[in-house]
């Protein structure tokens, strides 16, 4: 017996061939011997089966001895053994119709679980293998679960249902609602304007929700809310903003925040959360601000950084065009009685400069001794 796999909603063609390439009598019946369709004279006739309005045949191929049955808009209940009777012989075709759907909305927050459910007829023994856009492979029986979705799981999932060495492929589009980056760090010199950007990793027709940026300054004992905002159809409106610092927020996506001045007291890390309408849970992005200051006071040249820096970062003071350098894996370096010239303060990671600040040291003339 031939086995044919079909997809719910699709069209399937069950083939039946006569040995002689000519138009002849044929009938298609289901397992209960109820006639579905057949030929009477030169005309296609239909029986009292449930399939009558969805079953058809390719009349153009009859004279070639091909008496296929086409079933449109397949339903799981169409799964059955179909019998083609032609030239005093019977050909049996077992049709198994499957459907694969996501249990919940296909727009899921990062970290949420995805469950794919296979709709299958009684008597089937399917297995399912799914491949994520990022190349992750999962397999199961009638249910497949991905416990924690990641950004890279966004896109088209390809799932193959196998039964009796036959396969049928399903494509399911999954959108993981997340920010493009989990974390980002902005490096600024003291006094510079700071731009924070929070681009989303997805696009939606209508995007509505509310968000907040909480900030933990390095120098502060507790965190505080810097800004709260609403999002309505991709339009951003500020609800409440702290007085210090006076943040500004862009009115369009991507979410964009401007801090007028980078100051040591603002250095630290923040967490932007975004709650989307009709979604449980929140999107998160961490943002860090590192501020650098270079100062000369009397005979001491100092370079300092504030904010979250990793221990492997190097802070250096270097005299331009000269070999003189002071380096430390620390948050402050200094030079006593620095030579005159342009000094560079550099914050670097394995040789890559993340932040630099220049400071000019002017020569100090010895104070004339009073006679």
């Amino acid at each position: 017996k031939k086995v044919v796999l079909g997809k719910k909603g699709d069209t399937v063609e069950l083939t039946c061939n006569a040995s002689q390439k000519k138009n002849t009598q044929f009938h298609w019946k289901n397992s209960n011997q109820i006639k579905i369709l057949g030929i009477q004279g030169l005309f296609l006739t239909k029986g009292p089966s449930k399939l009558s309005d969805r079953a058809d045949s390719r009349k153009s191929l009859w004279d070639q001895g091909c008496f296929s049955m086409i079933i449109k808009n397949l339903k799981i209940e169409d799964s059955d053994t179909y019998i083609c009777e032609v030239e005093n012989k019977k050909e049996e075709v077992e049709l198994l119709v499957f459907g694969l759907t996501a249990n919940s909305d296909t727009h899921l927050l990062e970290g949420q679980s995805l469950t794919l459910t296979l709709e299958s007829p009684p008597g089937s023994s399917p297995s399912v293998k799914c491949r994520s856009p990022g190349g992750k492979n999962i397999q199961g029986g009638r249910t497949i679960s991905v416990p924690q979705l990641e950004r890279q799981d966004s896109g088209t999932w390809t799932c193959t249902v196998s039964q009796d060495q036959k396969t049928v492929e399903f494509k399911i589009d999954i959108v993981v609602l997340a920010f493009q980056k989990a974390s980002s760090t902005v490096y600024k010199k003291e006094g510079e304007q700071v731009e924070f950007s929070f681009p989303l990793a997805f696009t939606l027709e209508k995007l509505t929700g509310s968000g907040e940026l909480w900030w933990q300054a390095e120098r502060a004992s507790s965190s505080k809310s810097w800004i709260t905002f609403d999002l309505k159809n991709k339009e951003v409106s500020v609800k409440r903003v702290t007085q210090d610092p006076k943040l500004q927020m862009g009115k369009k996506l991507p979410l964009h925040l401007t801090l007028p001045q980078a100051l040591p007291q603002y250095a630290g890390s923040g967490n932007l959360t975004l709650a989307l309408e009709a979604k449980t849970g929140k999107l998160h992005q961490e943002v860090n601000l590192v501020v650098m200051r270079a100062t000369q006071f009397q005979e001491n040249l100092t370079c300092e950084v504030w904010g979250p820096t990793s221990p492997k970062l190097t802070l250096s003071l270097k005299l331009e065009n000269k070999g003189a350098t002071v380096s430390k894996q620390a948050k402050a370096v200094w030079v006593l009685n620095p030579e005159a010239g342009m000094w560079q303060c550099l914050l670097s990671d394995s040789g890559q400069v993340l932040l630099e600040s220049n400071i000019k040291v002017v020569p100090t003339w010895p104070t004339p001794v009073q006679p």
Epitope: I76, E119, G141
Partner: antibody, heavy 125, light 107 residues
Framework: QVQLVESGGGLVKPGGSLRLSCAAS????????MNWIRQAPGKGLEWVSY????????FYTDSVKGRFTISRDNAKNSLFLQMNSLRAEDTAVYYC??????????????????WGKGTTVTVSS | EIVMTQSPAALSVSPGERATLSCRAS??????FAWYQQKPGQAPRLLIY???TRATGIPARFSGSGSGTEFTLTISSLQSEDFAVYYC?????????FGQGTKLEIK
């Protein structure tokens, strides 16, 4: 542990209705296909209905089509059988049962392994 | 629908002896076949699925064989708790069907 407990059975007159419930516990109910099977007094077993994990795919045996409705509430871990236009021949113990599977390499074997203790339905005037 | 025919309808065997129960399907059910045991006032208990795979917790004295249309359940050495009604079951085609049962009695 895995448990299925049926309830809602009782005595009903021909033409009457009953709603059977099956409370599931000890497993993730929403992952499993479920079934109702019945056994007339002193008789053999008859498969009544089959429902997919999502509730979208449903099959009935011919003798109950149009009269019985199987449904499920995954949030409440419950399976139901609404029985209308009851007849004397519907008198039976009704069992709810879970479809299980095991796999060997890529091949999956399905079977009905977990049954409840049953609830008795008597249709009599 | 597929008709399942069990033989014999009743079987009397002494404890410790071997019992062989048969089941025939009216058409091929491949290996989508199971055996159940039922004791009075209890729900059926799955013994064998996939024609020959023992269900979890089923003693090794129970074994199933066959495929297509002919199936056999063998109990190698009968224990007192094995006396019950045994049903065969096909789950290849809807509606799923059972045999009429074989009553295994103590001789």
């Amino acid at each position: 542990q895995v448990q299925l407990v049926e309830s809602g059975g009782g005595l009903v007159k021909p033409g009457g209705s009953l709603r059977l419930s099956c409370a599931a516990s000890g497993f993730t109910f929403s992952d499993y296909y479920m079934n109702w099977i019945r056994q007339a007094p002193g008789k053999g077993l008859e498969w009544v209905s089959y429902i997919s994990s999502s509730g979208k795919t449903i099959f009935y045996t011919d003798s109950v089509k149009g009269r019985f409705t199987i449904s499920r509430d995954n949030a409440k871990n419950s399976l139901f059988l609404q029985m209308n236009s009851l007849r004397a021949e519907d008198t039976a113990v009704y069992y709810c049962a879970r479809e299980d599977y095991s796999n060997y390499e890529d091949y999956y074997y399905y079977y009905t392994g977990v049954w409840g203790k049953g609830t008795t339905v008597t249709v009599s005037s | 629908e597929i008709v399942m025919t069990q033989s014999p309808a009743a079987l009397s065997v002494s404890p410790g002896e071997r019992a062989t129960l048969s089941c025939r399907a009216s058409q091929s059910v491949s290996s989508k076949f199971a055996w159940y045991q039922q004791k009075p006032g209890q729900a059926p208990r799955l013994l064998i699925y996939n024609a020959s795979t023992r269900a979890t917790g089923i003693p090794a004295r129970f074994s199933g064989s066959g495929s297509g249309t002919e199936f056999t359940l063998t109990i190698s050495s009968l224990q007192s708790e094995d006396f019950a009604v045994y049903y065969c079951h096909q789950y290849k085609n809807w509606p799923y069907t059972f045999g009429q049962g074989t009553k295994l009695e103590i001789k």
